[in-house]
């Protein structure tokens, strides 16, 4: 028998520095977790103790904090090289700055292979990107070799900016021939490493002949065997065992997100490359694990540029940006309109001639807007200003919901109106009229939504049975502020870009902004 230790991360999302327990900014260092310096300590400890170790990343290193905003992926290559990752799969967020924003900082600078079998380049890009990412990689591990095949969510064109010269194929269809190639090379230990979410990970384990282990990402799935060490609730045991169509037991793993845990899986193979046993658990990277001093020193060196960036002007406002709770929790506020407009702008993807865009709607809990911005400071808007408005380090995500769920959400928005509660919704691409004289649960008297399958966008009444795409904060997608119906009834959820980054990019693009209160949210009494 031959034993392999797989260490794995996924959806790190720019958390290079240690974070608080909820993966936001570290406040009390004695309680902080994760970060590359702490990760390195644990990885090195395992490498010294065990003979055959692979360190793998299942994608979405990009996007999530000011580190990515400033360094644009150079930080990912630098610190992943320093940690000596053995391979990485491309995630959807790796395309957030377009293909060039992937090629230059990461693909050309990584000293390890970057993989995806289901992304095919065409046209002029094919020769430019050739060899910079691979469908599979054979890695030497001790006296053996291990094959790694990569995959990426085929929804990436809707979630990021891969351009028109990359084709995202069905994962299972694309993976099978690559696994078959590995088999012809007499590689009999094969790991599928990818970024399509836990449901697809399980399907790959079931359907792709020859895959021995699946290491996934995208869905931030936390798996654990036994008593979990922090706040995350396990979606199943670690590893999650799938019985393949040809009768094999295939372990599937994922390690939550944000570098909070290091996935740790031990696999025993027989001489024919069959999995005999698999066991392990994610390791919580808490403060009991010291940060490596040399990596920490490097982090501090890179940090200097971030502090300078946060006080630089992004753009100007010529109007007061009303982000006060007195406005945003009671009525339409222009800060809410600005943020929603930025959210939609960030999700412009012309992927189908029939649609001017794939999504037109935004909802945003008023309680998530934490500060106004005064225009009487020469109109200057900085990252620091935006961090006061959006201090929680969330993301603006894409969900699919039925019209009936949206109607419930808008009823919830005003079910206890007048108490300055955070659930009052700010909107984009939506016109809502409330009648507060009616009883809670029956106060939405008009709800019109902007069409997407149209050449001239216009507002049409919401249809209860229709499925709509909506951009909203991850806080709402997870049922925050009492929006349980969103969490319970959503049909799809893909995590998006860092909230501050979305707004800062929009302001930089527009240069001068002047959002108005324009009748998106109205109140009426009487006959409707």
């Amino acid at each position: 028998a031959w034993e392999l230790t797989i260490l794995h991360t996924n959806d790190v999302h720019s958390r290079l520095e240690q974070t608080s327990e909820d993966s936001s900014k570290c406040v009390n260092a004695s309680r902080c977790m994760g970060g590359v310096a702490r990760l390195f300590t644990k990885v090195q400890q395992i490498r010294r103790a065990e003979p055959n170790v692979l360190l793998l990343d299942a994608g979405d290193q990009y996007q999530g904090t000011i580190w990515f905003t400033v360094y644009k992926g150079a930080e990912v290559a630098h610190f992943m090289n320093a940690l000596r990752y053995d391979a990485m799969a491309l995630g959807n967020h790796e395309f957030d700055n377009g293909v060039e924003g992937l090629i230059e900082p990461l693909l050309k600078e990584a000293k390890f292979p970057i993989l995806s079998a289901n992304i095919k380049a065409k046209g002029p890009l094919a020769s430019q990107i050739s060899g910079l990412y691979l469908p599979y990689k054979v890695l030497p591990v001790g006296d053996e070799v291990v094959g790694i095949v990569g995959y990426t969510s085929k929804e990436t064109p809707f979630l990021s900016n891969p351009g028109t010269n990359l084709v995202f194929e069905d994962e299972i269809t694309a993976l099978q021939p690559e696994v078959d190639k590995l088999k012809t090379l007499n590689v009999n230990k094969i790991i599928a490493l990818g970024h399509s979410g836990f449901e697809m990970d399980k399907l790959i384990a079931q359907k792709v002949r020859g895959v021995d282990v699946v290491v996934g990402g995208h869905s931030n799935t936390f798996l654990y065997t036994g008593n979990p060490p922090s706040k995350e609730v396990p979606a199943g045991k670690y590893p999650f065992i799938v019985t393949s169509d040809d009768g094999r037991k295939v372990p599937v793993v994922q390690a939550y997100a944000f570098g909070k845990y290091l996935g740790y899986l031990k696999i025993e193979f027989d001489e024919r490359g069959n999995v005999i046993s698999s066991h392990g658990n994610p390791i919580l990277l808490n403060s009991s694990i010291p940060e490596d001093p040399s990596i920490k020193a490097d982090i501090n060196k890179w940090r200097i540029k971030l502090d300078n960036y946060s006080t630089q002007e992004l753009g100007k406002t010529i109007v007061y940006l009303d982000g006060s709770s007195q406005s945003c929790r009671f009525r339409e506020c222009n800060m809410g309109n600005l943020i929603c407009d930025a959210m939609i702008n960030n999700n412009l993807r012309h992927t189908d001639e029939m649609f001017w865009n794939h999504v037109s709607m935004c909802i945003l809990n008023g309680g998530g807007i934490r500060s106004p911005i005064d225009e009487r400071n020469n109109g200057t808007i900085t990252w620091e200003n935006l961090a006061a408005v959006l201090p929680f380090g969330g993301t603006f995500d894409l969900v699919q919901l039925k019209g009936s769920t949206l109607k419930k959400a808008f009823e919830h928005s005003v079910h206890r109106y007048g108490q300055s509660t955070g659930e009052f919704l700010q909107v984009g691409g939506i016109h809502v009229v409330y009648d507060l004289s009616r009883k809670p649960g029956d106060r939405v008297v008009k709800l019109d939504v902007l069409c997407t399958k149209c050449r001239v966008p216009s507002y049409d009444p919401l249809k209860m049975d229709e499925v709509y795409k909506v951009i909203l904060p991850n806080f709402l997608a997870n049922g925050g502020d009492g929006f349980q119906m969103i969490k319970d009834e959503l049909l799809r959820h893909d995590s998006g870009d860092q909230d501050i980054n979305v707004v800062s990019t929009y302001i930089s693009k527009m240069k001068v902004i002047y959002p108005a209160v324009e009748g998106r949210i109205k109140f009426s009494t009487g006959s409707h």
Epitope: R84, D86, K108, E109, A110, K111, F112, P113, G131, L132, L134, K137, V138, L139, P140, V141, V145, L185, N186, V187
Partner: nanobody, 124 residues
Framework: QVQLVESGGGLVQPGGSLRLSCAAS????????IGWFRQAPGKEREGVSC????????YYADSVKGRFTISRDNAKNTVYLQMNSLKPEDTAVYYC?????????????????WGQGTQVTVSS
């Protein structure tokens, strides 16, 4: 476009020397482990030598130890194979190959990019 081009092959007498070069274009060679392989007619391709991208450590097949030396010049984006005390059994097509990773290997399966090869003939 990632490309590797070998040169320096030729006809040499037993006991003689040759220096093979492998020039890379389209990528930075210092990010890659580089290996030299050879294939004699009717035989399997065999690993001759490789050099690490991280610390410059070198590895040799037993059959060439003490006679062949691999080196790299990252500034010139080139890897060399100095072959001394050549024997008739060294006759083969010599290929250079490259892959990104941390662990040098003489296993051909781990290499992603290959040159077209240069013929080395050792004969009197």
């Amino acid at each position: 476009q990632v490309q590797l081009v070998e040169s320096g092959g030729g006809l040499v007498q037993p006991g003689g020397s040759l220096r093979l070069s492998c020039a890379a274009s389209g990528f930075t060679l210092d990010y890659y482990n580089i290996g030299w392989f050879r294939q004699a007619p009717g035989k399997e391709r065999e690993g001759v030598s490789c050099i690490s991208n991280s610390d410059g450590s070198t590895y040799y097949a037993d059959s060439v130890k003490g006679r062949f030396t691999i080196s790299r010049d990252n500034a010139k984006n080139t890897v060399y194979l100095q072959m001394n005390s050549l024997k008739p059994e060294d006759t083969a097509v010599y290929y250079c190959a490259a892959y990104r990773g941390w662990h040098p290997s003489l296993d051909a399966r781990v290499y992603d990019y290959w040159g077209q090869g240069t013929q080395v003939t050792v004969s009197s």
